[in-house]
Interface confidence: low
């Protein structure tokens, strides 16, 4: 067990703070909830503290919860590939570029670390080149979320990892909006981290609303499990 992994044996409170600017539309989001890495479970509620969110909530899911991949359930035989927990409590910087097909892109930078007993994900998001009447700024996405695989590889040069995956957002007209994610994680501290063999995270997310919440918000339930490395066959992935 890595030193960081010991911090995730129970339920951990989570705080998410995002400041965003998409095509000049500025907004802030605060999120609170908890994570249980034993089950790879996240429960979070996000509120736009600046009024109405200028982009659809589903476009921010990866930035919020795929940001705290330290809550992913790594089976016993894969624990030596869990970079995310090994970087704790000092945490990691997570940077992403998200390309929305035939539309604009988000660039995000986050610091994910423990502040006291709470796992905090502080994010800045800058979005440019979006069409005002496109699927994103035109709010044409359905309020739901598909399952995805998130592919992880070691980045030995930077003592971190590189991650990429493609999100499929459902559009109201029945088509799909693709969002290509390119991600890089680097540890904040100087301590040793686990550099993984190639593997993936399998994610399932459910979006809902709080009937008592008047503000623009999103309620998220998510399960994430690591996979792709079989018992005693690590040499196949080297």
């Amino acid at each position: 067990m890595s030193k960081g992994e010991e911090l995730f044996t129970g339920v951990v409170p989570i705080l998410v703070e995002l400041d965003g600017d998409v095509n000049g539309h500025k907004f802030s989001v605060s999120g609170e909830g908890e994570g249980d890495a034993t089950y790879g479970k996240l429960t979070l509620k996000f509120i736009c503290t600046t009024g109405k969110l200028p982009v659809p909530w589903p476009t921010l899911v990866t930035t919020f919860s795929y940001g705290v991949q330290c809550f992913s359930r790594y089976p016993d035989h894969m624990k030596q590939h869990d970079f995310f927990k090994s970087a704790m409590p000092e945490g990691y910087v997570q940077e992403r570029t998200i390309f929305f097909k035939d539309d604009g892109n988000y660039k995000t930078r986050a610091e994910v670390k423990f502040e006291g007993d709470t796992l905090v994900n502080r994010i800045e998001l800058k979005g440019i080149d979006f069409k005002e009447d496109g699927n994103i700024l035109g709010h044409k996405l359905e309020y739901n979320y598909n399952s995805h695989n998130v592919y992880i590889m070691a980045d030995k040069q930077k003592n971190g990892i590189k991650v990429n995956f493609k999100i499929r957002h459902n559009i109201e007209d029945g088509s799909v909006q693709l969002a290509d994610h390119y991600q890089q994680n680097t540890p904040i501290g100087d301590g040793p981290v686990l550099l993984p063999d190639n593997h993936y995270l399998s994610t399932q997310s459910a979006l809902s609303k709080d009937p008592n919440e008047k503000r623009d918000h999103m309620v998220l339930l998510e399960f994430v499990t690591a996979a792709g490395i079989t018992h005693g066959m690590d040499e196949l992935y080297k």
């Epitope: 400041d19 500025k26 600046t50 610091e111 800058k126």
Partner: nanobody, 121 residues
Framework: ESGGGSVQAGGSLRLSCAAS????????MAWFRQVPGKEREGVAA????????YYADSVKGRFTISQDNAKNTVYLQMNSLEPEDTSIYYC???????????????????WGQGTQVTVSS
């Protein structure tokens, strides 16, 4: 803005930014600086709501940002000034909470006219 001027290396200056038509007790107030021909660089910011402060690495321990809500004014106390601090200093305001690191100038909605600070060796 006011309080700029010329000073010897190692000296101090205090910049003031009195906001009119904008309430400093909400959102974020920041100081930026710009050398002609270069991008504006974030120096310090203060979250008006809770007083949380943020500093660029180059000024940590030397500069202090503070606010006086009653006077609707934000200050930048600059100690141990170095020739590299020579620049035009701008005060900026955003109706949103401060980003946790000093993000690009596009974050801010309101800007002052700028005040020149010159530090000679």
């Amino acid at each position: 803005e006011s309080g700029g001027g010329s000073v010897q290396a190692g000296g101090s200056l205090r910049l003031s930014c009195a906001a009119s038509g904008y309430t400093v007790s909400r959102g974020c107030m920041a100081w930026f600086r710009q050398v002609p021909g270069k991008e504006r660089e974030g120096v310090a910011a203060i979250n008006s709501g809770d007083g949380t402060t943020y500093y660029a690495d180059s000024v940590k321990g030397r500069f202090t940002i503070s606010q006086d809500n009653a006077k609707n004014t934000v200050y930048l106390q600059m100690n141990s000034l170095e020739p590299e601090d020579t620049s035009i200093y701008y005060c900026a305001a955003s109706r949103l909470r401060c980003p946790w690191n000093l993000v690009s100038a596009s974050w801010y909605d309101f800007w002052g006219q700028g005040t020149q600070v010159t530090v000679s060796s």
